[in-house]
């Protein structure tokens, strides 16, 4: 499918200053658009709340690793 022309871009302008428990996290997505001022991660919580986080922070990287592992197809 072709990209939408002038599709809206989600950006993060501020990051959470609190570490979020991985048990509260459901998924994440990256914000890498050059239209945004900051490289960012948006976590979606189990109650569908979206939270901006700083990908340079260790807890953010560890949380992404944890969520990635949950997508792993079990070996039979």
């Amino acid at each position: 499918q072709p990209d939408a022309i002038n599709a809206p871009v989600t950006c993060c302008y501020n990051f959470t200053n609190r570490k979020i428990s991985v048990q509260r996290l459901a998924s994440y997505r990256r914000i890498t658009s050059s239209k945004c001022p900051k490289e960012a991660v948006i976590f979606k919580t189990i109650v569908a709340k979206e939270i901006c986080a700083d990908p340079k922070q260790k807890w953010v990287q560890d949380s992404m690793d944890h969520l990635d592992k949950q997508t792993q197809t079990p070996k039979t």
Partner: nanobody
Framework: EVQLVESGGGLVQAGGSLRLSCAAS????????MAWFRQTPGKEREFVTL????????DYTDSVKGRFTISRDNAKNTVYLQMNSLKPEDTAVYYC????????????????WGQGTQVTVSS
């Protein structure tokens, strides 16, 4: 925008070793899951191995387990692939890939790719 540059490929005899390197620039390297894939003419890109952001988790395709080792140096923005006991069937173009998106080992889950480095194993 992450740029990836592979090096270290070449021609080696069966049973030999090679070490591939992939240097990253343009992003927070330690925030990307890194992987190596390989491709032979007419075939889909095949997962070889991956390493988590922390380096604490790795995964390998069955055919390279015990022979290949992936590692990363987040201070040097580099991921490595040590390839031992090489076989002719390891001949391929090897690609380094970085994933910002959630996922594991499917090539469509990887956002950034290097240009590839040729590995040829002769019998």
């Amino acid at each position: 925008e992450v740029q990836l540059v592979e090096s270290g490929g070449g021609l080696v005899q069966a049973g030999g070793s090679l070490r591939l390197s992939c240097a990253a620039s343009g992003g927070t390297f330690s925030s990307y899951r890194m992987a190596w894939f390989r491709q032979t003419p007419g075939k889909e890109r095949e997962f070889v191995t991956l390493i988590s952001r922390s380096g604490g988790t790795t995964d390998y395709t069955d055919s390279v387990k015990g022979r290949f080792t992936i590692s990363r140096d987040n201070a040097k923005n580099t991921v490595y692939l040590q390839m031992n006991s090489l076989k002719p069937e390891d001949t391929a173009v090897y690609y380094c890939a970085a994933a910002g998106s959630m996922g594991w080992n499917h090539f469509r889950e990887y956002d950034y790719w290097g240009q590839g480095t040729q590995v040829t194993v002769s019998s």
